[in-house]
């Protein structure tokens, strides 16, 4: 049994890091493998992650972490029974994938303005809370070419757009994702999409 693709990990910089790797053949990850991880810190304890299958030869493990900070560094040991298959390390702050924003809502009752709001996925005491910027994707269910991205570079998790910038009388969907420049993160996954019917009063022409 050998590791074909070494584990690569990403952290949500809050409580979970996800590691993925590939074996050289079909593997029952949960029964045959264990990923041990330990913070390189005084008094830290070793933890064991039981991996799940991710395709025939692929495995994925969700590592639970407390109080993640930039100085943290973890040792990782991948075991198959008594055999050490791979040894490495992982610094969560250098591989951050933020959590996806939630609770995306479209408010259509503000005079010909669409107000989109969503929730910041981090608590106020997490460093990323004040450092997320967002991308909002809006698209038409009827017209695949009607697809647009709005970059939200301010901290408030909201976006206002004129309803008239979209076509009237048709349905639209929106979703939002986040990233943080400070840790050079990847983009988060998209939030679940929300749907609304866009209708607004056409301006009266003289």
């Amino acid at each position: 049994m050998k590791v074909l693709q070494e584990p690569t990990c990403v952290s949500d910089y809050m409580s979970i890091s996800t590691c993925e790797w590939k074996m050289n053949g079909p593997t029952n990850c949960s029964t045959e493998l264990r990923l041990l991880y330990q913070l390189v810190f005084l008094l830290s304890e070793a933890h064991t992650c039981i991996p799940e299958n991710n395709g025939g030869a692929g495995c994925v493990c969700h590592l639970l972490m407390d109080d993640v900070v930039s100085a943290d560094n973890y040792t990782l040991d991948l075991w198959a029974g008594q055999q050490l298959l791979w040894k490495g390390s992982f610094k969560p702050s250098e591989h951050v994938k933020p959590r996806a924003p939630g609770n995306l809502t479209v408010h259509t009752n503000v005079s010909d303005t669409l107000l989109l709001t969503w929730s910041n996925p981090y608590p106020p005491d997490n460093y990323l809370y004040n450092h997320l910027t967002y991308a909002v994707n809006i698209w038409s269910e009827n017209d695949p070419a009607d697809f647009r991205i709005y970059n939200v570079t301010y901290l408030e998790p909201s976006l206002r757009i004129a309803a008239s910038t979209l076509k009237s009388g048709i349905s639209y969907r929106a979703r939002v994702r986040a990233w943080a420049q400070c840790y050079n993160t990847t983009w988060s996954e998209w939030s679940p999409s929300t749907k609304w019917h866009n209708s607004y009063r056409e301006p009266f022409e003289q």
């Epitope: 008094l43 930039s70 100085a71």
Partner: antibody, heavy 116, light 111 residues
């Protein structure tokens, strides 16, 4: 919100021991390390040691090795710092502080006076 | 005996800028991150800066930190009378055993 509530002031005689408590609330108690530091009157801060509330293991500054013991009670989310063989130089305000590499939150402090 | 050295005192007028230095060595500041604490008279210390230059939520951006080599600096701009306090730097040292030294402390007076 995070609160670290420390026990009240103590007056002790030289040679005695003192046990200071620090009750934590507003966060997952076993997820954060706890430090203890002290500050003699008009002096700076001095680090004493750190405890991992999850497993209960502790590590102490070399200066206090053999004289200090840090423990925790997960059922009450409380950490304790006991200092023995007290001398007058141990008169200080003793602080618990939540954190790992740095101290996010501090208790208000417990004044321990050692006097004959 | 603290291994992190700070000036005993600094002073400046309201609205001015002041800097406080913290000098250490290769086994502590040179190899770790620096934090800064503010201690108002009669109160417990409060985290002001961590990770060399990051501010906890609620700390105004008038406070900033930096690190270069084995020294660190706390800068306070737009001084206010409420900033009058003692300031301590802190880090950790893993040279022999893990320890968390604090700086000697600096008394800031707002004139």
């Amino acid at each position: 919100q995070v609160q670290l509530v420390q026990s009240g002031a103590e007056v002790k005689k030289p040679g005695a021991s003192v046990k200071v408590s620090c009750k934590a609330s507003g966060y997952a108690f076993t997820s954060y390390y706890m430090h203890w530091a002290r500050q003699a009157p008009g002096q700076g801060l001095e680090w004493m040691g750190i405890i991992n509330p999850s497993g209960g293991s502790a590590s102490y500054a070399q200066k206090f090795q053999g004289r200090v013991t840090m423990t925790r009670d997960t059922s009450t989310s409380t950490v304790y710092m006991e200092l023995s063989s007290l001398r007058s130089e141990d008169t200080a305000v003793y602080y618990c502080a939540r954190g790992k590499y740095w101290m996010y939150d501090w208790g208000k402090g417990t004044l321990v006076t050692v006097s004959s | 005996q603290s291994v992190l050295t700070q000036p005993p005192s600094v002073s400046a007028a309201p609205g001015q800028k002041v800097t406080i230095s913290c000098s250490g060595g290769s086994s502590n500041i040179g190899n770790s991150y620096v934090s800064w604490y503010q201690q108002l008279p009669g109160t417990a210390p409060k985290l002001l800066i961590y990770d060399n230059n990051k501010r906890p939520s609620g700390i105004p951006d008038r406070f900033s930190g930096s690190k270069s080599g084995t020294s660190a600096t706390l800068a306070i701009t737009g001084l206010q009378t409420g900033d009058e306090a003692d300031y301590f730097c802190g880090t950790w040292d893993t040279s022999t055993v893990w320890e968390w030294p604090f700086g000697t402390g600096t008394k800031l007076t707002v004139l």
